[in-house]
């Protein structure tokens, strides 16, 4: 479905301004901050969401060990440059002319430099590991129930094709969700794993991007899954380029 016709809102992105000024009086929604028209039948790209967020007023055994090249977003929020299709531009700079290269999920993958820094291409993040710790419950969740519900969540809420959810690992209280999507696998219209991971992260932090009641209520056989900590690791198709100084 498109943006809701009755009250003209964007079901998949509350950080929009909508009005019935599209073709034939149809509801059209534009992302805050950038003014880019968004498709309300699918997820909005993380770059546009981050830009909208920055424009808003301020108020062990079965578990995967992240690859040595895995990136964690330690830099936090910034006001990104997005291309016309809403993707992150390969090079990002701040107001003081400090620049760096990012991957397709907007995470820095090089040392910071000046305006002379070159970022030849936007490197794709093809593997995302979402690491969650849930609040203690009376007993462990049943792994197969947890697996099924998380896969259903990514399929139905985030519209991510099931083939991109590679695995769900569980060792109480840690849950790991592996998303994999190579450039060659992603067809036109497919939700990007980076966008799905971002929506999920905001959901479990109680900051849902969906229009509506404002919270994710994730249940496994009726038991609410309360996430107490979230870490996301990003693995790029080309390893990041940091100086040895940063690694020590």
């Amino acid at each position: 479905h498109t943006a809701a016709q009755d009250n003209c809102t964007c079901p998949t992105n509350k950080m929009t301004v909508c009005s019935p000024d599209g073709p034939g009086g149809r509801c059209q929604c534009r992302a805050l901050g950038s003014g880019v028209a968004v498709d309300c039948s699918t997820l909005t790209s993380e770059c546009l969401l981050l830009k909208a967020r920055m424009s808003a007023p301020k108020n062990a055994r079965t578990l995967v060990r992240p690859n040595e090249h895995a990136l964690v977003d330690n830099d936090g929020l910034y006001d990104p440059d997005c291309d016309p299709e809403g993707r992150f531009k390969a090079r990002q700079c701040n107001q003081t002319s400090v620049c760096w290269c990012v991957n397709s999920v907007g995470v820095r993958r090089t040392d910071k430099g000046d305006l002379s820094l070159r970022c030849d291409e936007l490197v794709r993040t093809h593997h995302i590991l979402i690491d969650l710790r849930h609040r203690p419950t009376a007993g462990a969740f049943n792994h197969s129930d947890l697996d099924a519900e998380l896969r259903r969540l990514f399929r139905e809420r985030y519209r991510l094709h099931p083939k991109f959810v590679a695995a769900v690992h569980y060792e109480q209280p840690t849950i790991q969700i592996e998303l994999r999507q190579n450039t060659s696998q992603k067809a036109a219209g497919d939700v990007d794993i980076g966008d799905a991971a971002y929506y999920f992260e905001r959901d479990v932090k109680g900051e849902s991007l969906f229009q509506g009641r404002g919270g994710l209520d994730l249940r496994v056989r009726g038991e609410p899954l309360q996430v107490e900590r979230t870490l996301i690791y990003y693995l790029d198709e080309i390893p990041p380029k940091f100086s040895m100084k940063r690694l020590t």
Epitope: R135, R152, L153, E156, V204, K205, G206, G212, R213, D217
Partner: antibody, heavy 119, light 112 residues
Framework: QVQLQESGPGLVKPSETLSLTCTVS????????VNWIRQPPGKGLEWIGV???????NYNSALMSRLTISKDTSKNQFSLKLSSVTAADTAVYYC?????????????WGQGTLVTVSS | DIVMTQSPDSLAVSLGERATINCKSS????????????LAWYQQKPGQPPKLLIS???SRESGVPDRFSGSGSGTDFTLTISSLQAEDVAVYYC????????FGGGTKVEIK
């Protein structure tokens, strides 16, 4: 639009099994669950049980030994069976949609059906 | 099981005056991850099914007049009707969904 409609016999004899059907439209049975709630005449609401979208069920512990909730996706129907009924099971029975990941709220209800347990 | 206790059982308020209904749960309804409370308020008029008014303890449903507001966290919650209208005469129920579901006993609101 989303609609739920309860149906079943209005009169059930004591010790027999109460059987109700909730026929739904406007949403997928694989994407949303359905709850059953009852209300004895002049009294408050009592949650009976739920069938979640994933197919699992949870029941009110006080009714669990007598209760079965199931669904028939091909008919867009949920069913409730409550065995060994007594006069205390006389109530208006409602089905209500679970709002999936937006919260376990009951935003859509059927109109309810009155079931009287009497010989 | 979580027990929900509503007070008062009934309430008579003059038109235009404030009506306050309290709901207490036997354990905390707060999700520590999202900082949201698993509590809803419903309105039921005679011969009708209940209607969802408030979710997550304080989020008003679409189309619900802004004279209705929900507040509270943990174990103590309040539904307030800031200026009672004739059409607000009904029974109001709180409901927890932290551990399956339990309704409060209901509060009947009438006009004085």
């Amino acid at each position: 639009q989303v609609q739920l409609q309860e149906s079943g016999p209005g009169l059930v004899k004591p010790s027999e099994t109460l059987s109700l059907t909730c026929t739904v439209s406007g949403f997928s049975l694989t994407s949303y669950g359905v709850n059953w709630i009852r209300q004895p005449p002049g009294k408050g609401l009592e949650w009976i049980g739920v069938m979640w979208a994933g197919g699992s069920t949870n029941y009110n512990s006080a009714l669990m030994s007598r209760l079965t909730i199931s669904k028939d996706t091909s008919k867009n129907q949920f069913s409730l069976k409550l065995s060994s009924v007594t006069a205390a099971d006389t109530a208006v029975y409602y089905c209500a949609r679970d709002e999936n990941w937006d919260g376990a709220w009951f935003a859509y209800w059927g109109q309810g059906t009155l079931v009287t347990v009497s010989s | 099981d979580i027990v929900m206790t509503q007070s008062p059982d009934s309430l008579a308020v003059s038109l235009g005056e404030r009506a306050t209904i309290n709901c207490k749960s036997s354990q905390s309804l707060l999700n520590s991850g999202t900082r949201k409370n698993y509590l809803a308020w419903y309105q039921q008029k005679p011969g009708q099914p209940p209607k969802l008014l408030i979710s997550w303890a304080s989020s008003r449903e679409s189309g619900v007049p802004d004279r209705f507001s929900g507040s509270g966290s943990g174990t103590d919650f309040t539904l307030t009707i800031s200026s009672l209208q004739a059409e607000d005469v009904a029974v109001y129920y709180c409901k927890q969904s932290y551990n399956l579901f339990t309704f409060g006993g209901g509060t009947k609101v009438e006009i004085k």
